[in-house]
């Protein structure tokens, strides 16, 4: 029969696991919100055609199904920051592009872990920044929907 000490330790483990899952869910929701905010601004701006941002190629992972695949998103945050800096105008204003990207990076690292040994396998096909953001939004939504509530 299980002792009271082993029962309490397994309960504590379960609680800790639940807490981690909740945190992970929160981080995913935060990342999703940030990417959606960025896409929304880009979509509006794209309709006002000074389309330099569409000339930048972004690369997507061959397959993205796990949190470790967020390494592929982190690898492309530099070019994303460059696009934001380049497209600032009265019509497209992101008060602090540097902070915005930095916050995304922090959230990504929290989700995938700080281990950078995983090497991203990029697809051969490149995408515009708009398609790139759409793809990562779909990734977040997919992970959130399959996570245990």
């Amino acid at each position: 029969a299980p002792t009271s000490s082993s029962t309490s330790s397994s309960t504590a483990e379960a609680q800790q696991q639940q807490q981690q899952q909740q945190q992970q869910q929160q981080h995913l929701e935060q990342l999703l919100m940030d990417l959606q905010e960025l896409l929304s601004r880009m979509e509006n701006y794209r309709n006002l055609k000074l389309p330099r941002m569409l000339t930048f190629k972004f690369y997507l992972p061959k397959q993205a199904t796990e949190l470790k695949d967020l390494q592929c998103l982190e690898d492309e945050l530099g070019p994303l920051r460059h696009v934001l800096d380049l497209t600032q105008s009265k019509s497209f204003q992101l008060e602090d592009a540097e902070n915005f990207i930095s916050n995304i990076r922090v959230t990504v690292v929290k989700l995938k872990g700080s281990d950078n040994t995983f090497e991203c396998q990029f697809d051969d096909e490149s995408a515009t920044v708009v398609d790139f953001l759409r793809r990562w939004i779909a990734f977040c939504q997919s992970i959130i929907s399959t996570s245990p509530q």
Partner: antibody
């Protein structure tokens, strides 16, 4: 139907100034970035400058920076190119163009206006 | 300043496939665009974002890109394809647009 009509070209002496206009119609001008592209006689295309829909972002080719100024008047749906300190090598047909569809390419072009810089 | 390099001329027999290349250091990170210009006319966009065709452009024109080279392919070239073709992209900063020097396509009669 989208229409871009350039005007203001002509013969001008080196060192003088000229202002080109591009009258736009058939689309919501204030939504779109606009470009100037030129082509010297018998030569290739050269991008000159572009301006964002609201006029807040302007970019210039190195060959014209400091001499040419791109501007727009959204109320008049007109794009301008002020050309100062003109040189013989600025002789070209000047086109205005706009990326109208959902791409970065220049989908619509005017018929061009010829600028000749010669003494 | 940034340059896009194209061959000055390409010749093919009618019905053959013509390939026009455009090379530039920034092309792994920038999309290429292609324009067709017939004598005495304004240029026409035929390919955007490496390989997309605007509506009204025939399927005989296609684009691709690999590394520092973008390629425009004209399959089954006909006399009406005779024109100057220009590639177009932005430089390393993304701030300046640049045209290639242009390639004259001749379809040998």
């Amino acid at each position: 139907e989208v229409q871009l009509v350039e005007s203001g070209g002509g013969l001008v002496q080196p060192g003088r100034s000229l202002r080109l206009s591009c009258a736009a119609s058939g689309f919501t001008f204030s939504y779109y970035g606009m470009h100037w592209v030129r082509q010297a006689p018998g030569k290739g295309l050269e991008w000159v400058a572009d301006i964002s829909n609201d006029g807040s972002n302007k970019y210039y080719a190195d060959s014209v920076k400091g001499r040419f100024t791109i501007s727009r008047d959204n109320s008049k749906t007109t794009l301008y190119l002020q050309m100062n300190s003109l040189r013989p090598e600025d002789t070209a047909v000047y086109y205005c163009a706009t990326p109208y569809y959902d791409s970065s390419g220049l989908d619509y072009w005017g018929q061009g206006t010829l600028v000749t810089v010669s003494s | 300043s940034y340059e896009l390099t194209q061959p000055p001329s390409v010749s093919v027999s009618p019905g053959q496939t013509a390939r026009i290349t455009c090379s530039g250091d920034a092309l792994p990170k920038r999309f290429a665009y292609w324009y067709q210009q017939k004598a005495g006319q304004a240029p026409v966009l035929v390919i955007y974002e490496d390989n997309k065709r605007p509506s009204g452009i025939p399927e005989t024109l296609s684009g691709s890109s690999s590394g520092t080279t973008a390629t425009l392919t004209i399959s089954g070239a006909q006399e009406e394809d005779e024109a100057d073709y220009y590639c177009y992209s932005t430089d390393n900063t993304g701030g300046l647009w640049v045209f290639g020097g242009g390639t004259k396509l001749t379809v040998l009669g």
